[in-house]
Interface confidence: medium
């Protein structure tokens, strides 16, 4: 069983809100991790969207609009990415990853390589 799990695809109507789920395997505690979200459009490198540890400890990627937001459900061991006012350009692959709080700056300051880290999962928003 992979460390992280995301549904392979999700869709919603334009203008609505969609919530992507990233579930961490039960032998890990999401409470101690920051959840990182990346977006990748076809033919483009991934870009960092946001990092979420808690409401008081989170960061948005540069120029990422506030309609992208993160949250966590510690009881269910899940991280969430909500995209409100869904737009055509939001059609993309979304990757979640877990990282320690302390490595926030290094984690979010790099684009990912073609081979995603083992702790990465993805959801396509068609």
């Amino acid at each position: 069983q992979p460390v992280l799990h995301q549904p392979p695809a999700m869709s919603s109507a334009l203008g609505t809100t969609i919530r992507l789920t990233c579930t961490l395997r039960n032998d890990h505690d999401i409470g101690v991790y920051s959840v990182y979200w990346y977006q990748q459009r076809p033919g483009h490198p991934p870009r960092f969207l946001l990092r979420y540890f808690s409401q008081s400890d989170k960061s948005q990627g540069p120029q990422v609009p506030p309609r992208f937001s993160g949250s966590k459900d510690v009881a269910r061991n899940r991280g969430y990415l909500s995209i409100s006012e869904l737009q055509p350009e939001d059609e993309a692959m979304y990757y979640c990853a877990m990282g320690a709080r302390s490595s926030e700056k290094e984690e979010r300051e790099r684009e990912w390589e073609e081979e995603m880290e083992p702790t990465a999962a993805r959801t396509r928003v068609p």
Epitope: F48, Q63, E109, E111
Partner: antibody, heavy 120, light 107 residues
Framework: EVQLVESGGGLVKPGGSLRLSCAAS????????MSWVRQAPGKGLEWVAY????????YYADSVKGRFTISRDNAKNSLYLQMNSLRAEDTAVYYC?????????????WGQGTLVTVSS | DIQLTQSPSFLSASVGDRVTITCRAS??????LAWYQQKPGKAPKLLIY???TLQSGVPSRFSGSGSGTEFTLTISSLQPEDFATYYC?????????FGGGTKVEIK
């Protein structure tokens, strides 16, 4: 202060080779995608090549594909463009440009440019 | 490849004029468009990204609008330092492409 300084331009004969370098300073080079953009004398801008921060994603303009190679050395804060089989139409000022962190595809900092002249 | 067509190619205007430059894309690019200003012998300077977001340090007299295939760059009140060539650029897909440029000259 962000600085990008190109070097390596000059006069070369058709069919020849040249290697351009771009020395970056004032920012964490290893976290940014970089591009080369060129401008022929009296003409507009033409994007040439892109490389992401870890070299895992590389793209080229059709006009240079198979002849030019973009690379980088993050330890040296340097970007390179190896140009082979040069043609007269490659004559241009070559700019090194930093991709915006959020997209990589638009450029918030540019070097001063280095002139490449291909002529017999 | 996505083609960008800028109009006009040349524009004569006076200080204080309101100037509008148009950029049309050959296919829809949402808001993946940037605008640059270039002065003779200098490197381009980013003015606007994401079609309408002003780059830090750029005067507020510059504004961008549009989405899909039609975009505009507006200078609300032309200043002496604004006489330059302006380029649009799409980053919707690779290869990245630029418009042909619009040269703004003193009338």
């Amino acid at each position: 202060e962000v600085q990008l300084v190109e070097s390596g331009g000059g006069l070369v004969k058709p069919g020849g080779s040249l290697r351009l370098s771009c020395a970056a300073s004032g920012f964490t080079f290893s976290t940014y995608g970089m591009s080369w953009v060129r401008q022929a004398p009296g003409k507009g801008l033409e994007w040439v090549a892109y490389i992401n921060n870890g070299s895992g994603y590389i793209y080229y303009a059709d006009s240079v594909k198979g002849r030019f190679t973009i690379s980088r050395d993050n330890a040296k804060n340097s970007l390179y463009l190896q140009m082979n089989s040069l043609r007269a139409e490659d004559t241009a000022v070559y700019y090194c440009a930093r991709g915006q962190w959020w997209s990589g595809g638009d450029f918030d900092y540019w070097g001063q440019g280095t002139l490449v002249t291909v002529s017999s | 490849d996505i083609q960008l067509t800028q109009s006009p190619s040349f524009l004569s205007a006076s200080v204080g004029d309101r100037v509008t430059i148009t950029c049309r894309a050959s296919q829809g690019i949402n808001t993946w468009l940037a605008w640059y200003q270039q002065k003779p012998g200098k490197a381009p300077k980013l003015l606007i990204y994401a079609a309408s977001t002003l780059q830090s340090g750029v005067p507020s007299r510059f504004s961008g609008s549009g989405s899909g295939t039609e975009f505009t760059l507006t200078i609300s009140s032309l200043q002496p330092e604004d006489f330059a060539t302006y380029y649009c650029q799409q980053l919707n897909s690779y290869p990245l492409t630029f418009g042909g440029g619009t040269k703004v000259e003193i009338k």
